[in-house]
């Protein structure tokens, strides 16, 4: 069961896995949640009654019964991991800790104007886990305004001490705020021979890459496939690092694959969620339970529902045995990965889906699209919303995209003449406008946030956020789309679609069924040639066919230009403006969302 509240002056007895240092009980709970085995924790706050060497200790604990005896202890704060909860979880920690020095390896020291600048430096440095900044009131003159970037093997401090006039905090890489590049390629027949920080077993290079991404010290990896000549090293995933942050040694070797941590774009890819099944593959590990199950899918469900289960192997039933039920082996290990992977024994293996909630909802696979045709089907574009105005009469005003459970991203120009958010209604999960009746449920708008540099669509900054009055419960027909990563600026998107209920030609009417059109992106240089009278800035992105014929049009404004990349849909553009609709050599112009990620996060993550 999910217990979120913290238990003051309470200590859990026994079950210790390991001790780390965290600046707060709240962060200790996050560390416990992300640890492969931790179910409970006890944190020791600073207190005159406690030995200072025990301040800020976070003891991670496990228990077969999922609970432990409670003991009263002043300054102890205990609680449960969020593994047992169904809500979305994030490792993002923007808190700044005053008068705390978080100890680690100080590998970089420089002058910074503020703690915020120091935190940004940490976020954009590949090695940095956390920082300590000496403020201008720091007693030692030569250390004032010094920003120390730090790292450790675990990503958490090795100790935390009280120190006046310093502040400390964590890298914001896990908040999607890093400008570091995101190298998504996996290099076949390549070994990176740099330092290994850890090794785990993985069924394929993709899982190896995801493990690297959420391992605090891993910058790149090498994976030995099941065809690797050395049997003892098959399925071995080597997690690696180097001083420069890049591999210094690339060696050609067949049956090996190498790649990079996707830390700086992890909010738009699944990192914890290994949803595939591995056929004719057995995962070895500590056995938790053996239960009968009808299929490998049922076995995965059983593993997901058992909080301590990390992975499983299903052995299908021998004909007519046990009512057609096979055996489902629920397993765990110290690091969440199989201790060995065997092939050719007929098992079907996979991982718990319990950790999927640690990934952004937007990375969830949606139903396969219908190829061809222009009318969409239900659930094809679950982030698309229709924004209605009720004044003077109710009508479709603009499109928009769900980007969070209380947030819609749309175009600023949609709100020309809109005096109050009270007249707006957001409908999600809609395919046909005719579905919208008086009693159809909608989301009221609490606030319209228009970019403060917006003047008119053609001059850019055509972007706005709607904060909803209530939260969206995600389902197959309404769920968010991922924002592009800042580290993905150089990605060339080839599978882009514009959707909306807008006109199908310049003089037309709003369409009943949500329309879709696949449209190629056009370079900004090419786009500028087509719009000599306008300035096409890097904050705009263009899409269209040279010959015209397919485009967004009136009523599509604010809606998404959605591009699929590595199986995940990204909101690359917001429909903004164009000369006419679908005219020859007149591409549509869209707000280039990647250039506004900081603005979006600043507005949506504001406390």
């Amino acid at each position: 069961e999910c217990v979120t509240q913290l238990l003051k002056d309470t200590c859990f007895e026994g079950g210790d896995i390991t001790t780390v240092f965290t600046p707060s009980a709240k962060y200790c709970q996050v560390v416990c949640t992300y640890h492969p085995r931790c179910l409970l924790f006890t944190f020791t706050a600073e207190s005159p009654s406690e030995d200072p060497t025990r301040w800020f200790t976070c003891v991670l604990k496990d228990s077969v019964t999922e609970t432990l005896p409670r003991v009263n202890r002043t300054a102890a704060i205990s609680g449960y991991s969020f593994k047992q909860c169904s809500h979305q979880i994030s490792a993002c920690n923007k808190d700044i800790y005053v008068d705390l020095d978080m100890k680690g390896i100080n590998y970089n020291s420089s002058v910074a104007k503020s703690a915020q600048e120091c935190q940004e430096r940490c976020t954009d440095d590949v090695h940095c886990h956390f920082f300590t900044y000496a403020t201008r009131q720091f007693p030692s003159l030569e250390h004032r305004n010094i920003c120390l970037l730090k790292h450790t093997q675990t990503g958490t401090p090795t100790r935390i001490t009280k120190l006046d006039k310093v502040v400390s905090g964590f890298s914001l890489k896990s908040c999607a705020l890093s400008n570091l590049a995101c190298i998504r390629d996996i290099f076949p027949n390549t070994v990176f021979a740099d330092s290994n920080i850890d090794s785990v077993m993985a069924p394929d290079a993709f899982v190896c890459g995801r493990i690297c991404t959420h391992h605090p010290g891993c910058l790149f990896f090498t994976f030995f496939s099941q065809e690797w000549p050395k049997e003892s090293q098959r399925n071995l995933c080597l997690l690696k690092t180097s001083e420069s942050g890049l591999p210094s040694t690339r060696i050609k070797k067949s049956k090996a694959l190498s790649g990079f941590s996707l830390q700086s774009c992890r909010h738009s890819i699944p990192v914890f969620c290994h949803s595939s099944f591995y056929h004719d593959t057995d995962f070895l590990g500590e056995e938790l339970d053996i239960v009968a199950a009808k299929s490998h899918e049922a076995c995965q469900k059983l593993c997901t529902n058992a909080v301590r289960c990390q992975f499983f192997t299903y052995t299908p039933a021998q004909a007519s045995c046990n009512e057609g039920k096979g055996k489902c082996y629920l397993k765990l290990s110290s690091n969440g990965s199989p201790t060995k992977i065997l092939h050719g024994r007929g098992g079907i293996s996979g991982y718990t889906l319990r950790l999927c909630k640690m990934d952004n909802e937007c990375t969830t696979k949606i139903k396969p699209r219908i190829v061809g045709g222009t009318a969409s089907v239900r659930g094809e574009w679950p982030w698309q919303v229709t924004l209605h105005t009720t004044s003077p009469t109710q009508r479709h005003l603009c499109g928009g995209s769900i980007i969070g459970n209380q947030w819609i991203l749309t175009a600023a120009h949609c709100f020309y003449g809109v005096e109050s958010p009270k007249i707006l209604r957001v409908y999600s999960g809609i395919l046909n406008q005719s579905e919208i009746k008086e009693d159809t449920s909608f989301f009221g708008v609490q606030e319209i946030i228009i970019h403060d540099q917006y003047k008119m669509a053609e001059s850019g900054y055509d972007i706005a956020l709607l904060k909803l009055e209530t939260t969206v419960n995600y389902t197959d027909s309404q769920r968010p789309i991922c924002l592009p990563s800042k580290g993905d600026r150089n990605v060339i998107y080839t599978d882009c679609w514009v959707t909306g209920w807008g006109y199908r030609k310049l003089r037309d009417k709003i369409q009943n069924t949500l329309q879709k059109a696949k449209i190629p992106l056009v370079t900004n240089e090419e786009c500028q040639k087509r719009y000599r009278g306008h300035k096409i800035t890097h904050k705009m992105i263009c899409a269209g066919y040279r010959e015209g014929g397919k485009d967004a049009c009136k009523g599509d404004s604010g809606g998404p230009l959605s591009c699929k990349h590595n199986e995940v849909w990204h909101l690359v553009g917001i429909t903004s403006w164009g000369e006419g609709c679908a005219q020859r050599e007149r591409p549509g112009v869209y707000t280039n969302v990647v250039e506004y990620v900081d603005w979006i996060l600043e507005k949506t993550q504001a406390v």
Partner: nanobody, 126 residues
Amino acid sequence: QVQLVESGGGSVQAGGSLRLSCTASEFTFDDSDMAWYRQAPGNECELVSTITSDGGTYYADSVKGRFTISRDNSKNTLYLQMNSLKPEDTAVYYCAADQWGSAEGDCTSSYPGGYWGQGTLVTVSS
């Protein structure tokens, strides 16, 4: 039990040469990717050169053109011919089998299926 035994280390003047050997036993040498690593006092373990089972070679930039790696599968032996030695080549040299990168900067800890020798000291004086 797998054994890798290095020999040929010693003291030499800058500009001189040495040839290191590594004799392997208890595993199929010709199927293994072999390497030389080195660790200078206070420094991390660094890869010097690799020779794969099919004969492909790799050299660290700092030794390119001066060191040559080779293997004799019939003798289960790996070699490192070191010419034009410099004082900065001073280190303990380790022979390794199927070891792609050191672990935590140390030339002794391995992952499954990877093996290290005990090391041989090379001292280059100016």
